[in-house]
Interface confidence: medium
């Protein structure tokens, strides 16, 4: 049967929810399926279900909730049905379902270089998604960055920063890097997905060194 | 004030490519959906793409799936159509269009409220 | 895909004349209709959303209904400038169809 598979805001000031749509062999035909939602004004739900208000827009299998259909201080309750049978149903309320979209413009600058010039720290930075209202306050996101050797499959992981820059130390030079960074809105929904990956190669030891002019 | 406006029509030979433009004004094209529907010379209406930028998706008519890209860049309020693999029945004027869901929370479905005035798209040897 | 069948695919009306055109669709679409006017060279225009609701600016003459999968736009006086062709259109999945439309036409 079709099942809810996910509810996502990108910045708290829309929403979409996706569902299965798979017809399993042996199973009954089902009907065109529909989603209604309902939401709870101060203490009681309104009884009163509608229907998805945008079908379109998030893509097949989808309702979306635009800016004037998406309130964050309201609970919603939605669910899926078909043939007036009611197959799927979940509530949530909108912070609850924050997943920004991934951090934009990464890059990087050298720090510092270990005196033996095998080490060296650098500061990673980048942008909080296009979309997510920082300077008003409207969203407050956390960072997560990981890193790796290019050739390596685990990844390592820093903890979670509310800054858009954060040093990485002791790297190894001669080798290239993998650097990513993901977001979540703070105290509440998942994190995103994450950025673009960026390709930090460290130069070699002599062009770290300062070459003496001998005369 | 809302506008749309095309642009990147001309002739093309078959098998070639073109890249339409959709520059939007008065609206955030990341909050909106855009699509593409065109129109062959004294023919109907017929939808292409859509493209929703906030919930990452696109979509695509049949009769161009694998041939035709949509996509937007947020940060330009424009949205664009890649045409590749052009066919002779792809000759039509191409509109862009805003998909609106209107802001009664209890009033559904929405609807393509703001087009743009449409550009040539010629496919012939 | 869901499809929009409209009929007539033309018509002759007068000035003042009541013109109803009707689309069915192939299965379910709620109420997820809209109904456009367009002229010859120019992009079309909407008048009427989910089935029945009127589009800011158009006359009140333009009014929608649905009955079940039938859905109606009337003009309930034909002026002048109605002359055109009216197309329907489903958005109750990604993938929008639209009608083969109807051209009205001075009798």
């Known amino acids: 049967e079709p099942k809810f598979t996910k509810c996502r805001s990108p910045e708290r000031e829309t929403f979409s929810c996706h569902w299965t749509d798979e017809v399993h062999h042996g199973t009954k035909n089902l009907g065109p399926i529909q989603l209604f939602y309902t939401r709870r004004n101060t203490q009681e739900w309104t009884q009163e279900w509608k229907e998805c208000p945008d079908y379109v827009s998030a893509g097949e299998n989808s309702c979306y909730f635009n800016s004037s259909f998406t309130s964050i201080w309201i609970p919603y309750c939605i669910k899926l049905t078909s043939n007036g049978g009611t197959v799927d149903e979940k509530c949530f309320s909108v912070d609850e379902i924050v997943q920004p979209d991934p951090p934009i413009a990464l890059n990087w600058t050298l720090l510092n270089v270990s005196l033996t010039g095998i080490h060296a720290d650098i500061q990673v930075r980048w942008e909080a998604p296009r979309n997510a209202d920082i300077q008003k306050g409207w969203m407050v996101l956390e960072y997560e960055l990981q890193y790796k050797e290019v050739n390596e499959t685990k990844w390592k992981m820093m903890d979670p920063i509310l800054t858009t820059s954060v040093p990485v130390y002791s790297l190894k030079v001669d080798k290239e890097y993998e650097v990513r960074v993901r977001s979540k809105q703070r105290n509440s929904g998942n994190y995103g997905e994450f950025s673009e990956v960026l390709y930090v190669t460290l130069p070699q030891m002599s062009q770290f060194t300062c070459e003496e002019d001998f005369y | 004030e809302v506008q749309l406006v095309e642009s990147g029509g001309g002739l093309v030979q078959p098998g070639g490519s073109l890249r339409l433009s959709c520059a939007a004004s008065?609206?955030?094209?990341?909050?909106?959906?855009i699509h593409w529907v065109r129109q062959a010379p004294g023919k109907g209406l017929e939808w292409v793409a859509s493209?929703?930028?906030?919930?990452?998706?696109?979509s695509y008519a049949d009769s161009v799936k694998g041939r035709f890209t949509i996509s937007a860049d947020t940060s330009k309020n424009t949205a664009y159509l890649q045409m590749n693999s052009l066919r002779a029945e792809d000759t039509a004027v191409y509109y862009c269009?805003?998909?609106?869901?209107?802001?009664?929370?209890?009033?559904?479905?929405?609807?393509?409220?703001?087009w743009g005035q449409g550009t040539l798209v010629t496919v012939s040897s | 895909d869901i499809q929009m069948t409209q009929s007539p695919s033309s018509l002759s009306a007068s000035v003042g004349d009541r013109v109803t055109i009707t689309c069915r669709a192939s299965?379910?679409?709620?109420?997820?209709v809209a109904w456009y006017q367009q002229k010859p060279g120019k992009a079309p225009k909407l008048l009427i959303y989910?089935?029945?609701s009127l589009y800011s600016g158009v006359p009140s003459r333009f009014s929608g209904s649905r009955s079940g999968t039938d859905f109606t736009l009337t003009i309930s006086s034909l002026q002048p400038e109605d002359f055109a062709t009216y197309y329907c259109?489903?958005?109750?999945?990604?993938?929008?169809?639209f009608g083969q439309g109807t051209k009205v036409e001075i009798k």
């Open positions: 269009a805003r998909y609106n869901s209107w802001g009664i929370w209890w009033r559904p479905f929405g609807a393509l409220d703001y």
């Open positions: 008065g609206f955030n094209v990341y909050y909106s959906s």
């Open positions: 493209i929703s930028s906030s919930s990452g998706s696109t």
């Open positions: 299965q379910s679409v709620s109420s997820a």
């Open positions: 989910s089935a029945s």
């Open positions: 259109q489903q958005s109750s999945s990604s993938l929008i169809t």
